[in-house]
């Protein structure tokens, strides 16, 4: 094939090589950019900046090499449009620094920076950490800082991400209240800070105030939905990013729902309880306190991380006729109490009950102070019992 006379020539099925001396001063309008997986650039002294717009449309790019060129600056967001980038070789350029943000969000298997006049500062603490942790092939490069010695020997005691303290109200917060949060940011070289409020939705009206180093946030007219929702303060400096999340507990009274008993491998009387603080629960059977045992007990489902409501079952392992009756769930917290009742009929007497025998009880009197996986089975017979439809 005839030699390619252009600044950039195809290389393989999805590669591009740009090696003609001084032919490029930016990466705009590269031919076939949208399908490129590999881009090799060499001897481009006029290519001094790499910015967000330069790599727009290179969404498939996996390997980027810019070597022996004049690159002095790579923007923190330069690789925003190349999320699949896994190998980045920027050796033998004029880079003095490279922001931690530049590589954030990428899964780089290889990062080559040798041959650059790096300037040791806290802004390269992230790279020093890569070297310490053996990431991206960095240790093998034995990176040097221009006139300062090895990167590995750079003092880093003062190179920390910002320190955040979020102040939340001590007092109880009620539905309808306004809540003021304050985020105090400390640290060197603070660049940006803010709040992440994506979980809040309709939980409150939000008003931001202030700026570095003290950010204010007012949550007005809060609802009970604010419970378990993260309010996050973040801050960045040249070393990295810090985040602190807090939750505001909004008090509200206990509520409870009971549903019709359902038969699974065992029987379940489904319930839902809500309230902040979390309510204490107590079951009554036919009006008397039910003592929980391995045959009848409260079983909670895994709670959702972002809500206060708890779902569960009063689980009954192979109940009999003595368990037929009225079940009441009492829920109480300092802001109120609630109850719900349901009748459950599990089966008729399977033991040929003699009317002259005393009727057994399976509950404790109200003033009692008692604290309180089935085997894999082959069924020998059709179980007794009546099916109860889910309500």
């Amino acid at each position: 094939a005839a030699p390619c006379p252009d600044a950039c020539c195809p290389h393989g099925s999805s590669g591009l090589r740009c090696t003609r001396d001084g032919a490029l001063d930016s990466l705009h309008h590269l031919p076939g950019a949208e399908n490129l997986t590999e881009l090799y650039i060499e001897n481009q002294q006029h290519l001094q900046h790499l910015e967000l717009r330069d790599l727009r449309g290179l969404g498939e790019l996996r390997n980027l090499t810019i070597v022996k060129s004049g690159l002095r600056f790579v923007a923190p967001d330069a690789f925003h449009f190349t999320p699949r980038l896994s190998r980045l070789n920027l050796s033998f350029n004029a880079l003095e620094s490279l922001s931690w943000k530049t590589v954030q969000g990428l899964s780089l298997q290889e990062l080559v920076l040798s041959g650059n006049p790096l300037h040791c500062s806290c802004a390269l603490r992230w790279l020093q950490r890569w070297e310490e942790e053996g990431l991206g092939g960095v240790p093998e490069q034995k990176l040097q800082c221009h006139g300062q010695g090895p990167l590995a020997h750079m003092p880093n005691a003062s190179c920390g991400v910002p320190t955040l303290k979020v102040q939340v109200p001590n007092a109880s917060v009620d539905v309808g209240d306004d809540v003021l949060l304050r985020c105090q940011v400390e640290g060197r070289g603070l660049e940006q800070a803010g709040w992440i409020l994506t979980e809040l939705e309709q939980s409150a009206t939000v008003m931001k105030s202030g700026g570095l180093p003290s950010l204010g946030l007012t949550l007005a007219n809060v609802t009970s939905d604010l419970n378990r929702k993260n309010v996050t303060c973040w801050a960045e400096n040249d070393v990295g990013r810090a985040e602190v999340s807090v939750q505001v507990n909004v008090s509200f009274p206990a509520s409870v729902q009971l549903h019709t008993a359902v038969e699974m491998h065992h029987w379940c009387i489904p319930f839902s309880v809500d309230g902040q603080p979390a309510p204490s629960l107590r079951w009554l059977f036919n009006g008397s306190v039910l003592n929980e045992t391995s045959f009848i007990f409260t079983e909670f489902l895994e709670p959702a991380a972002n809500e206060t409501v708890r779902h569960g079952c009063l689980r009954l392992n192979q109940p009999t006729h003595v368990n037929n009756g009225n079940y009441t769930l009492l829920a109480a917290n300092p802001f109120g109490q609630a109850s719900a009742s349901i009748m459950a009929a599990f089966m008729d007497n399977p033991f040929e009950f003699n009317p002259e025998d005393p009727i057994p009880v399976s509950f404790s009197p109200v003033d009692t102070n008692s604290t309180s996986g089935d085997p894999v089975e082959k069924k020998d017979e059709t179980p007794f019992g009546v099916s109860v439809a889910v309500g």
Partner: antibody, heavy 115, light 108 residues
């Protein structure tokens, strides 16, 4: 499959406290099961001591209630038995098991009360 | 009463059917479970609840209940079935568990 393993001293002095631990493996102690202790004096039958749920609920044999404490340690996936003021009548093989059906048992550990 | 009563000993000819019984007031209200125990070993669950058999237990073992009596039936007893058998159930309050005194089964 769930396995249970009792451990603790095989000899306890009269009036002392018997302490045993049951380690649960092959399953979580925080599952929807209760955990129980049963004992069997030499040449005699089985006696239920008590049961516990990972949320702290517990029930004890009324004849032993004043002397028994059963506790659970979720972080170690184990539960324990303490029996105070022991006498020679408390000499037995002590078993831990999964309640309510006692479908998995430990191999048992003999505890002798003697001076 | 919160007691379960079993016959101390029962024998059966090899291959024949044997019934081991357990009596107690609480059995009018609650199911019995049955355990087999061989010398020097921990008990093994053979029947629980409404006549359920755990995985691995031969189908010659079955359970039933009538009035205040629960029964474990072995249909076609084998030599390896020779063991002590214990019943258990909830007591009449439903809050505690109780065991029967055990039945020693001999297979002749």
């Amino acid at each position: 499959e769930v396995q249970l393993q009792e451990s603790g001293p095989g000899l306890v002095k009269p009036s002392g406290t018997l302490s045993l631990t049951c380690a649960v493996s092959g399953g979580s102690i925080s599952s929807s099961n209760w955990w129980t202790w049963v004992r069997q004096p030499p040449g005699k039958g089985l006696e239920w001591i008590g049961e516990i749920y990972h949320r702290g609920n517990r029930n004890y044999n009324p004849s032993l209630k004043s002397r028994v404490t059963i506790s659970v340690d979720k972080s170690k996936n184990q539960f324990s038995l303490k029996l105070s003021s022991v006498t020679a009548a408390d000499t037995a093989v002590y078993y831990c098991a999964r309640a309510p059906w006692f479908d998995y048992w430990g191999q048992g550990t003999l505890v002798t009360v003697s001076s | 009463s919160s007691e379960l009563t079993q016959d101390p000993a029962v024998s059966v000819a090899l291959g024949q059917t044997v019934r081991i019984t357990c009596q107690g007031g609480s059995l009018r209200s609650y199911y019995a479970s049955w355990y087999q125990q061989k010398p020097g070993q921990a008990p093994v669950l053979v029947i629980y609840g409404k006549g359920n058999r755990p995985s691995g237990i031969p189908d010659r073992f079955s359970g039933s209940s009538s009035g205040n009596t629960a029964s474990l039936t072995i249909t076609g007893a084998q030599a390896e079935d020779e063991a002590d058998y214990y019943c258990n159930s909830q007591d009449s309050s439903g809050n505690h568990l109780i065991f029967g005194g055990g039945t020693k089964l001999t297979v002749l």
